[in-house]
């Protein structure tokens, strides 16, 4: 019983530093509680970007100070990361954990390469 997680290979952030992608998982069990974590991998270092736990059928809620927002629909999570700068370009991995009821299942996507280009400053107008 494996849990497969799918996410797009590449996403380009908007000029306002916003990137959205879908994280979809094939659940091997009937989970009622799911945790979704976005991890960033750069130079073999992995850091947590944001995480949210949700009850199936309910909305996904990140912490108030999180740079992520999202919505869930069945086994699909729509994730949005805000406030991105060029230096945040990297591989963003979607991790899905079936938390309850036991047994626990882990699923990790291959990662979405998010490219962020800082906008050119507007030229001074006379």
């Amino acid at each position: 019983k494996a849990m497969h997680v799918a996410q797009p290979a590449v996403v380009l952030a908007s000029s306002r530093g916003i990137a959205s992608f879908v994280c979809e998982y094939a659940s091997p069990g009937k989970a009622t509680e799911v945790r979704v974590t976005v991890l960033r991998q750069a130079d073999s270092q992995v850091t947590e970007v944001c995480a949210a736990t949700y009850m199936m059928g309910n909305e996904l809620t990140f912490l108030d100070d999180s740079i992520c927002t999202g919505t869930s629909s069945g086994n699909q999570v729509n994730l949005t990361i805000q406030g991105l700068r060029a230096m945040d370009t990297g591989l963003y991995i979607c991790k899905v954990e079936l938390m309850y009821p036991p047994p626990y299942y882990l699923g990790i996507g291959n990662g979405t390469q998010i490219y962020v280009i800082d906008p050119e400053p507007c030229p001074d107008s006379d």
Epitope: R35, K95, L106
Partner: antibody, heavy 119, light 108 residues
Framework: QVQLVESGGGVVQPGRSLRLSCAAS????????MHWVRQAPGKGLEWVAV????????DYADSVKGRITISRDNSKNTLYLQMNSLRAEDTAVYYC????????????WGQGTLVTVSS | EIVLTQSPGTLSLSPGERATLSCRAS???????LAWYQQKPGQAPRLLIY???SRATGIPDRFSGSGSGTDFTLTISRLEPEDFAVYYC?????????FGPGTKVDIK
């Protein structure tokens, strides 16, 4: 740097109780699943229990279900293992271990605390 | 429950030789969620490999992991004196998380 320090081990009679503690430092405690793994003298490693993130969800090995309770206090960065109705076969070194960001492998371990169940 | 079997039980080799350790699962380990640990007497285990092939921080490149499904391998390309120890595999794709019985690598 990440540090895990267990305490609370000792010699206890069969049927009695014991509580182990693990003080964590050097990382954001609430972002990680925390585990107890034990090793009987001269034997291999056995996963005992996990407690996830905010402490609401837990899972146990069949060999300890109903006798052992895992808990955590995120405000104190501390993990606990309450062991009841102890048996001779619970004699082991108990390790506290941190789960990895990319899954529940164990990337940091404490030094272990020895629990001996004997009359 | 996924049962892990390790072979051989003991591997007797000399420093400089190549060590090949096997870990076999009773059912497929999803997405290669398999880790390897090294343990020396009187010490806690140390993570070597996760995700079947990713080296943990600070682990020398003489250690490498491979495999998928039910068959996994830990290779130590050239044994150093400090590599003589017991090695355990562990699956973490689903609970209960299970360890293999270990392979002892000792000096010939």
């Amino acid at each position: 740097q990440v540090q895990l320090v267990e305490s609370g081990g000792g010699v206890v009679q069969p049927g009695r109780s014991l509580r182990l503690s693990c003080a964590a430092s050097g990382f954001t405690f609430s972002s990680y699943g925390m585990h107890w793994v034990r090793q009987a003298p001269g034997k291999g490693l056995e996963w005992v229990a996990v407690i996830w993130y905010d402490g609401r969800n837990k899972d146990y090995a069949d060999s300890v279900k109903g006798r052992i309770t895992i808990s955590r206090d995120n405000s104190k960065n501390t993990l606990y293992l309450q062991m009841n109705s102890l048996r001779a076969e619970d004699t082991a070194v108990y390790y506290c271990a941190r789960g990895g960001l990319l899954g529940p492998y164990f990337d940091y371990w404490g030094q272990g605390t020895l629990v001996t169940v004997s009359s | 429950e996924i049962v892990l079997t390790q072979s051989p039980g003991t591997l007797s080799l000399s420093p400089g030789e190549r060590a090949t350790l096997s870990c076999r699962a009773s059912q497929s380990v999803s997405s290669s969620y398999l880790a390897w640990y090294q343990q020396k007497p009187g010490q806690a285990p140390r993570l070597l490999i996760y995700g079947a092939s990713s080296r943990a921080t600070g682990i020398p490149d003489r250690f490498s992991g491979s495999g998928s499904g039910t068959d996994f391998t830990l290779t130590i390309s050239r044994l150093e004196p400090e590599d003589f120890a017991v090695y355990y595999c562990q699956q973490y794709g689903s609970s209960p998380f299970t360890f293999g019985p270990g392979t002892k690598v000792d000096i010939k």
